[in-house]
């Protein structure tokens, strides 16, 4: 469940974040899953752990494998797994599917292409951008912070876009590339007041004390690419991150799923080891865009353990 796929190219930097979240003050230990051998934290090593991050500087094909991270706090431990695959560099221009990050869609109004995973790295502008291996030139293309903006998008702009940047670690520079497909939507999209599909308003969710529980907040916002749309959970009117209960975390589901042509977003609230006090909270699923905000509230109730008949 708490496993994340990561991939990179040999001789490039790769930085992987532990899929389990924790406060910055918590210690995070990393291990090779197969051998249970601890990964060093000394930066002189080619592969080393740095808090929530595992750094391959640079990566080698032999680094491929599953890595375990354990987030340790005074009261609990949480385990996550990073499934890392390092590929040999391609000699030709084609980027295979297994190296592609999620596809993004653009339209005349909104044509931002974000450079995937860049936030994990210590990089400085400008980014270099390539389309189908050709360096992008011309005033229509603008590299801005961590994304590329294309002016006056046309259907011909569809294709595979690669961002290239330099990661700096203690004065040493490492190259990083990441590729994603960009599709252009012809049809005119539109935006609606958010519609929450789940949970139902004032839903009561049955949970078992001591077990884990998941709540999904799912909402649709219109058709086509949405300029500003978000779903999130709040506890008693407080952001999850500010609530300060590490057992309760929210995690993005599908980024933008187009079911029936509608643009929808999911956010999953994971409650580990449900406690009595969790039953007293109000769980607000909030969906918002430029039109406004809609709220559906969920409460938890204790599921009575099934009585066996003799």
């Amino acid at each position: 469940k708490f496993s994340k796929q990561s991939w990179g190219l040999e001789n490039e930097a790769l930085i992987v974040r532990c899929p389990r979240q924790g406060k910055p003050s918590y210690t995070v230990d990393w291990y090779y899953s197969q051998t249970n051998k601890s990964i060093p934290t000394q930066e002189r090593n080619r592969v080393f752990a740095s808090g929530q991050l595992l750094k391959f500087l640079p990566a080698a094909v032999a680094d491929s494998g599953i890595y375990t991270c354990i987030v340790r706090s005074p009261t609990f431990n949480r385990t996550g797994y990073a499934n890392v695959t390092i590929y040999k560099k391609q000699s030709d221009c084609n980027v295979p599917d297994y190296l592609m990050y999620s596809t993004v869609s653009g339209s005349e109004k909104n044509s931002k292409i974000y450079c995937p995973t860049i936030d994990l790295y210590n990089w400085t502008a400008p980014l270099e951008w390539f389309k189908n291996c050709q360096a992008l030139q011309g005033s229509r293309y603008r590299a801005h912070k961590s994304f590329l903006v294309i002016d006056n998008v046309m259907t011909e702009d569809a294709g595979d876009y690669t961002c290239k940047f330099i990661h700096n670690e203690n004065g040493a520079n490492y190259s990083v590339t990441a590729t994603r497909s960009f599709t252009v939507k012809d049809e005119q999209g539109f935006s609606l007041f958010p519609v929450i599909g789940a949970p139902a308003q004032n839903e009561i969710k049955e949970v078992e004390i001591g077990k884990n529980a998941n709540l999904t907040c799912s909402a649709c916002f219109g058709k086509g690419t949405q300029f500003l749309a978000a779903v999130l959970w709040q506890l008693n009117g407080t952001k999850i991150t500010d609530f300060g209960e590490p057992r309760i975390q929210q995690e993005e589901g599908q980024n933008q799923s187009f079911s029936n042509g509608l643009a929808c977003l999911d956010m999953v609230l994971r409650i580990a080891d449900v406690k009595e006090e969790d039953l007293l909270l109000q769980y607000d699923c909030l969906a918002l865009n430029l039109h406004g905000l809609r709220r559906h509230t969920v409460r938890l109730s204790r599921k009575n353990p099934s009585k066996e008949c003799f």
């Epitope: 308003q201 918002l288 406004g292 905000l293 809609r294 709220r295 559906h296």
Partner: nanobody, 118 residues
Framework: ESGGGSVQAGGSLRLSCATS????????MGWFRQAPGKEREGVAA????????FYADSVKGRFTISQDNAKNTLYLQMNTLKPEDTGIYYC????????????????WGQGTQVTVSS
Amino acid sequence: ESGGGSVQAGGSLRLSCATSGVTYRRTCMGWFRQAPGKEREGVAAIYTSGGFTFYADSVKGRFTISQDNAKNTLYLQMNTLKPEDTGIYYCAAEAGDECSASSVFRSWGQGTQVTVSS
């Protein structure tokens, strides 16, 4: 509400609203206005838990809604005012499970007059 008055086009005003009777969490609060002989028009709203803000198209980029939890006060900063912004401005609260500039509020204040002359 307070802060209303007369101002020349292009000028600014800041409206304030004391909201001590309102539960400040999980609440939608906003401003609406009514010009003589016209229908009530939503101006701006804020969802107090998180400070998410929403505006009518006619005021986007000119008006800013904000809250001060410590002072239990709601504000509307109005810049680049136009004659069509003239009207009585009402501070409002409690819109149920929706929040937008056009929310239907359950309670509102006495109103403060804003007059913009060209």
